[in-house]
């Protein structure tokens, strides 16, 4: 806590400008009016304040807004955002996507910090659901964002938002998460034709049930091995050799190199040797 001291004569700040970088911490506390700071927050980022000076500016805003900052201030926090604690952020009510983008930009290139996680949580809860624009924004900054959500949180994602999801956004999702996302993707893409549908649904297939895989096998989709290896074992096991052959097309040749790995290993063990022999790969059940 900075001690309350009177502002020296002639040092009262009329505006937020570069001259303030020469102020000592106590001078900033005494000479910068919190209301002035709040209205000119957009200038703070252009001035090379030290971390200690930023601490003083934050303290002034905390005093002015003990219940939490208004969005007009939050949007212009810039690097001051890095000084905020999750407790500070929980007091905020962020509703504008522009505000969210501005703060995520500050943290760009770094891991998701507790502050950012809290900010996103507040924003999404405020909106009531993870809409397409929000998802677009979040996955652009954090490709792994979607897979960091629990299945319960993912259940609030409307099918329309699925259009914003890119294949790399699902790279770290586990089967439980894909179980939630797959039905939404199926609904979102249901009006697309066969080949276009497969391109879109492919990344979500780790949540697909057996009957959907059987249906895909009738559509000449040529699923690659990387996708096949991510399918649920329990969904793959009931597939016949003929269905797997149709599902994979030319990619079926890749089964040999994967014969010791799940789900291929478990699937092979379920098949009749005569059927496996038809694949021409020397697979042993």
């Amino acid at each position: 806590e900075v001690e309350k001291t009177a502002c020296p004569s002639g040092k009262k700040a009329r505006e937020i400008d570069e001259s303030l970088i020469f102020y000592k911490k106590w001078e900033l506390e005494a000479c910068v009016d919190a209301a002035l700071l709040a209205t000119q927050m957009d200038r703070v980022n252009a001035i090379p304040f030290t971390y200690e000076q930023l601490d003083v500016l934050k303290h002034k805003l905390d005093e002015l807004y003990p219940q939490g900052y208004p969005e007009s201030v939050i949007q212009h926090l810039g690097y001051l955002f890095l000084k905020m604690s999750p407790e500070d952020i929980r007091k905020w009510n962020v509703t504008s996507l522009e505000t969210l983008k501005a703060l995520l930009e500050v943290n760009k290139g770094h891991e998701m910090s507790p502050q950012v996680a809290t900010l996103i949580d507040r924003f999404v809860k405020g909106r009531g659901q993870l809409d397409k624009d929000t998802l677009d924004t979040l996955t652009a900054f954090y490709p792994g964002y979607l897979c960091s959500l629990s299945p319960e949180e993912l259940s609030s994602v409307p099918p329309s938002s699925i259009w914003a999801v890119r294949p790399q956004d699902l790279d770290t999702c586990d089967p439980r998460q894909l179980d939630v996302l797959y039905p939404k993707a199926r609904l979102a893409f249901q009006n697309m034709n066969g080949s276009e549908y497969f391109v879109k649904i492919q990344s979500f297939l780790g949540g697909a049930p057996t009957e959907d895989l059987k249906a895909l096998s009738q559509q000449n989709v040529s699923m690659d091995l990387a996708t096949f290896m991510k399918l649920r074992t329990d969904a793959v096991l009931p597939l016949t050799v003929a269905e797997v052959q149709k599902l994979l097309g030319p990619h079926v040749e890749g089964l040999k190199a994967e014969e010791r790995h799940r789900p291929v290993r478990d699937w092979i063990l379920r098949q009749r040797q005569d059927d496996l022999d038809t694949l021409g790969l020397g697979l042993q059940g």
């Epitope: 890749g254 040999k256 190199a257 021409g280």
Partner: antibody, heavy 121, light 107 residues
Framework: EVQLVQSGAEVKKPGASVKVSCKAS????????MHWVRQAPGQGLEWMGN????????YYNERFRSRVTMTVDKSTSTAYMELSSLRSEDTAVYYC??????????????WGQGTTVTVSS | DIQMTQSPSSLSASVGDRVTITCKAS??????IAWYQQKPGKAPKLLIH???ELQPGVPSRFSGSGSGTDFTFTISSLQPEDIATYYC?????????FGGGTKVEIK
């Protein structure tokens, strides 16, 4: 010892067809798909397609799909590649090749000696 | 289809020189690339698979490196018997594709 022995050189007229054979020995024929690769004079290698020797299902390079037919005869462990509607640019050496499935879709570790097909009027 | 762009198309080097050939894939192929040597009138001979794994009996002067889309094949000290054309092959996709080849000659 694994061996792939191909049929002899052929000279064909434009518009005709050619059928090249590749007899495999030294391994279980039905455990490895057979691939065909061609090489025009002074040019690079071009993958033409492959065939499952167990039930004869082929997959072709789009470039040849309308003109190529790959077949197998399991009883003699022989693979065949037939190319129809021949033109001068089909003059090339045609190779059969067997993949090794150590990783992914497999690289070619054994090759036939090649069959020269000359298309000339 | 995956395109494999190989360079240079030809090179001339002295015995003992270090020779480097590159192959660039049009999409990520992990490390699924093989390198072949082909001498006139002969079938290609496998030298390296999975980017850097040397085939048994292949001299250690041959090596490979890379991953994703960019790959390098190196002959650390060129020998007269290395005069040949070298090809890369991607097998990350069942529809295999070769690079255009690099003809290596002695100065």
């Amino acid at each position: 010892e694994v061996q792939l022995v191909q049929s002899g050189a052929e000279v064909k007229k434009p518009g005709a067809s050619v059928k090249v054979s590749c007899k495999a020995s030294g391994y279980t024929f039905t455990n490895y798909w057979m691939h065909w690769v061609r090489q025009a004079p002074g040019q690079g290698l071009e993958w033409m397609g492959n065939i499952n020797p167990s039930q004869g299902g082929p997959y072709y390079n789009e470039r040849f799909r309308s003109r190529v037919t790959m077949t197998v005869d399991k009883s003699t462990s022989t693979a065949y590649m037939e190319l129809s509607s021949l033109r001068s640019e089909d003059t090339a050496v045609y190779y059969c090749a067997r993949p090794y499935y150590g990783s992914s879709y497999g690289y070619f570790d054994y090759w036939g000696q090649g069959t020269t097909v000359t298309v000339s009027s | 289809d995956i395109q494999m762009t190989q360079s240079p198309s030809s090179l001339s080097a002295s015995v003992g020189d270090r020779v480097t050939i590159t192959c660039k894939a049009s999409q990520d192929i992990n490390k699924y690339i093989a390198w072949y040597q082909q001498k006139p009138g002969k079938a290609p001979k496998l030298l390296i698979h999975y980017t850097s794994e040397l085939q048994p009996g292949v001299p250690s002067r041959f090596s490979g490196s890379g991953s994703g889309t960019d790959f390098t094949f190196t002959i650390s000290s060129l020998q007269p018997e290395d005069i040949a054309t070298y090809y890369c092959l991607q097998y990350a996709n069942p529809l295999r594709t070769f690079g255009g080849g690099t003809k290596v000659e002695i100065k």
